[in-house]
């Protein structure tokens, strides 16, 4: 006999990285017929919704009208059909950005390089933080962590065309509170020998520094830009 229902999916719109004082919507998708959804924040009940009519609705939206550091953290949701509750969703890490200061991002030897060259990004922030994050823009939002007193370096190693793209960095005051983003740096990689049509959309990085956020079959159920909790779930682990 089934004791629990399958876990729902949770994601944030427009993004899990939310500028302070901006609004974010947390979506929870369960099953048609669910009579109640609960959103939990850091283990405590945060909001409740009972969709009507339940048989025609399988997703609810929870709102955070005014993002701040108190609202940044881990969210999960559950739903109920009759008296039977679901397993909890994966954790969604909601991050508040645009806190305090703006870091500076630079790249060595420069933004235009030849395939095979070693490239290093430098993120600098003169205020009290020792953790830095480098993000490559794109559907799978790769995040690399680096550490340093006022500056962190992010060696990409020998680059390929897969490394092409726009990068930004953040200073991190804690796991869920990040600085303003740096100005973007666009990396252009030319002269690649390999067949570029076979190059992956995003490069693979050493497991100890990069989270690889692959779109799973779960994600296929939703809009492409909704990365669910996979990005956020892996981001801070």
């Amino acid at each position: 006999q089934q004791q629990t229902l399958p876990k729902p999916f949770i994601w944030a719109e427009p993004h899990f990285m939310v500028p302070k004082e901006k609004q974010v919507t947390i979506c929870c998708q369960g099953n048609y017929g669910a009579v109640e959804y609960q959103l939990h924040f850091e283990g405590s009940l945060f909001a409740v919704d009972r969709p009507k009519p339940p048989e025609r609705i399988n997703k609810v939206q929870f709102y955070i009208p005014d993002m701040n550091s108190r609202m940044a953290g881990q969210y999960s949701c559950i739903y109920r059909v009759g008296e039977l509750w679901s397993e909890p969703s994966n954790l969604l890490d909601l991050v508040v950005t645009e806190m305090y200061d703006t870091p500076t991002l630079s790249v060595h030897p420069g933004p235009e390089v030849i395939s095979g060259e070693k490239v290093t990004f430098y993120c600098r922030l003169d205020t009290a933080t020792s953790m830095f994050l480098l993000l490559k823009e794109g559907r799978s939002s790769h995040v690399q962590r680096g550490y340093g007193k006022v500056q962190a370096e992010f060696p990409l190693g020998p680059v390929t065309t897969a490394h092409r793209g726009t990068y930004r960095c953040f200073g991190s005051y804690n796991n869920h509170a990040w600085s303003f983003p740096s100005e973007p740096v666009k990396l252009l990689v030319t002269g690649d020998i390999e067949n570029t049509s076979l190059a992956p959309e995003d490069p693979t990085f050493p497991a100890d520094t990069w989270g690889t956020y692959l779109l799973t079959t779960e994600t296929g159920l939703q809009k492409d830009h909704a990365l669910w909790d996979h990005t956020a779930q892996n981001l801070l682990r």
Epitope: Q23, T25, F41, S44, L45, F46, A47, V48, D49, R50, P51, K52, V60, Q61, Y63, I64, P65, D66, R70, M71
Partner: nanobody
């Protein structure tokens, strides 16, 4: 900016009753969404004991169900909490709180059967009124 001012707290014997009031000023109830009474007791997190949303739907924490009643008087711009059959464990500081209006947030926010339970989702808070229940 909505301002909330509580009154009606005091000391009472177990089994007695109190009625808390929360006056909404600098704005009106029309500029809020969910309204709630939160209770802060020593050594415990602040919890929502009673919530009423813009549709007039109510929600109570299990420990006060059947004893407490939350109500809004929109004409008087007042939120009330009628507390009957009070118990010593009801002792604590009681705060009135309100969220932003759904018009500024999103359709469905604090309407129908949507309740904001966690205190972090409330934008406006009163200063609190103390309730002491002795055995």
């Amino acid at each position: 900016e909505v301002q909330l001012v509580e009154s009606g707290g005091g000391s009472v014997q177990a089994g007695g009753s109190l009625r808390l009031s929360c006056a909404v000023s600098r704005g009106s109830m029309a500029s809020t969404g969910c309204m709630a009474w939160f209770r802060q007791t020593p050594g415990k997190e602040r919890e929502a004991v009673a919530i009423i949303n813009i549709s007039g739907t109510t929600r109570y924490t299990d420990s006060v169900k059947g004893r407490f009643t939350i109500a809004q008087d929109s004409a008087k711009n007042t939120l009330t909490l009628q507390m009957n059959s009070l118990k010593p464990e009801d002792t604590g500081m009681y705060y009135c709180a309100a969220t932003q209006n759904p018009r500024t947030v999103g359709r469905g926010y604090c309407t129908g059967d949507y309740f904001q339970v966690g205190g972090g989702g409330y934008s406006f808070w009163g200063q609190g009124t103390q309730v002491t229940v002795s055995s």
